[in-house]
């Protein structure tokens, strides 16, 4: 039960991960205007990875594209790559999963299978939000850089009359919901890894030990009785471990997965 | 088609206030006060997103003027204290535009600040 | 503060003249996000209420005759009239659309020659 609870947990955090990933790279709002002493400001600015905005104090928000691809600068194409390799990984992971989730049941695929399944999406998941807290530190490392260079920049070449404020750019809304998104996949990839564990069946656990059947806080234990000799293949033990799991598992653990979904 | 009507003001002494008002219909996201002296150029004087309520004000009229809109009446609102004679002139309600242009404004109402 | 200066305060011009107005800021009105000077150009007259012609500098009102035009980026902006009519004379004022707050310049009055 423990092991359905974590495995479904993990799916559901990393669902709403890579929903918060798919999210975070479709805003606009990865860098903002920075607007230090003037917290009121007529045209206020917002990039994001596929387009620039300007929002005017008159309500009117205009957005351009990026239509050039060679003309960008080489980290916001890394960004772009990062955070797309992340849903790539993600969306394909959470396809995995689904098949692997003990509570649904595929044709007779074996535990040992679904246990491959999950720790796979796992690892998916754990390599897709590393991806996108990559991807948004990389962002956020450029903006820290740039903010400094242009307040460096703000205060000189004023000797004349005529002053020119250069623009600067502090972090928005997305690079948070990037770093949130991408920890939850993460975690929940973790989860999926921890569950596959306890999924993977134990060729000689509980050979010639009925009793163990009922127990299924001992039975989903993973690593337990490793060192102990077999009796070969015990196709009856077997069918009653599983059995026994599988229906406890489908009358509790399925209305809290279509609750989820 | 956006219709802008100001009222409210009048004569009135040194020290002394006045709330002026402007009917608006039309879709209005945000709205702007802006001052004319007799024979004068145009002044700005306050701004209002008329969704929000977010505010500001030209430097020489912050603490005395208050910008101020009415939803379920759709008015917008100038309450101006402390009144000083050289803040005689005909106000306008404008309505702010693409460019944070000033595309529409009503007819102007004429304060009068004398002893 | 941004100051707008226009220039000249006024002038007299007879009609089919061409006419030009111009107007500086104290700070570009260049817009880097947009790439759009956000410079407002308006006509008043005589106890009437301004009435816009020209935004960003260059984009013309819908309603406002063809012969208006506006030039410009960041600090120097111009407004022509390419053939000057009976009912173009007035007082032009340019605004600074850029930053709060707003700020008009001083106004060019165009008289008849």
């Known amino acids: 039960m423990a092991v359905t609870a974590c495995q479904g947990l993990g799916f559901v955090v990393s669902l709403i991960g890579i929903a918060g990933i798919i999210a975070a790279t479709c805003m606009d709002q990865w860098s903002t205007q920075d607007l230090y002493n003037n917290p009121v400001t007529a045209v206020f600015n917002y990039q994001g990875l596929w387009r620039s905005c300007v929002r005017e104090s008159s309500g009117f928000t205009e957005c351009r594209g990026y239509f050039t691809l060679l003309g960008l600068p080489a980290m916001l194409q890394a960004v772009r790559a990062l955070m797309i390799v992340g849903i790539v990984l993600g969306a394909i992971g959470l396809l995995v999963s689904i098949f692997a989730l003990k509570c649904i049941r595929i044709g007779s695929m074996e535990d040992s299978a679904k246990a491959n399944m999950t720790l796979t999406s796992g690892i998916m998941f754990i390599v897709s939000g590393l991806c996108a807290i990559a991807g948004v530190s990389v962002f956020a490392n450029m903006l820290v850089t740039n903010f400094w260079m242009s307040t460096a920049n703000m205060y000189t070449g004023m000797g004349g009359m005529v002053q020119t404020v250069q623009t600067r750019y502090t972090f928005g809304a997305a690079l948070f919901v990037g770093w949130v998104a991408g920890g939850l996949t993460l975690i929940g990839g973790v989860m999926m890894c921890i569950a596959c564990r306890g999924l993977a069946p134990e060729e000689t656990n509980y050979k010639a030990v009925s009793y163990h059947a009922s127990g299924h806080s001992v039975a989903y234990k993973p690593g337990g009785f490793k060192a102990s000799t077999g009796f070969g293949s015990n196709t009856k033990n077997k069918k009653i471990y599983d059995g026994g799991a599988r229906t406890e598992d489908e009358v509790q653990s399925y209305p809290s997965k279509h609750d989820y979904v | 088609e956006v219709q802008l009507v100001e009222s409210g003001g009048g004569l009135v002494q040194p020290g002394g206030s006045l709330r002026l008002s402007c009917a608006v219909s039309g879709y209005t996201f945000s709205m702007n006060w802006v001052r004319q002296a007799p024979g004068k150029g145009l002044e700005w004087v306050a701004w209002?997103?008329?969704?929000?309520?977010?505010?500001t004000y030209a430097d020489d009229f912050k603490g005395r003027f208050t910008i101020s809109r009415d939803d379920s009446k759709n008015t917008l609102y100038l309450q101006m204290n402390s009144l000083r004679a050289e803040d005689t002139a005909v106000y306008y309600c404008?309505?702010?535009?693409?460019?944070?242009?000033?595309?529409?404004w009503g007819q102007g109402t004429l304060v009068t600040v004398s002893s | 503060d941004i100051q707008m200066t226009q220039s000249p305060s006024s002038l007299s011009a007879s009609v089919g003249d061409r006419v030009t107005i111009t107007c500086k800021s104290s700070q570009s009105l260049l817009n880097s996000g947009n790439i759009k000077s956000y410079l407002t150009w308006y006509q008043q007259k005589p106890g009437k209420a301004p009435k816009l012609l020209i935004y960003?500098?260059?984009t013309l009102r819908s309603g406002v005759p063809s012969r208006f035009s506006g030039s410009g980026s960041g600090t120097d902006y111009t407004l022509t009239i390419s053939s000057l009519q009976p009912e173009d004379f007035a007082t032009y004022y340019c605004q600074n659309a850029y930053s709060f707050p707003f700020t008009f310049g001083q106004g060019t009055k165009v008289e008849i020659k």
């Open positions: 209002i997103n008329m969704y929000t309520g977010e505010r």
């Open positions: 960003w500098a260059s």
């Open positions: 404008a309505r702010l535009y693409n460019g944070n242009s000033l595309d529409y």
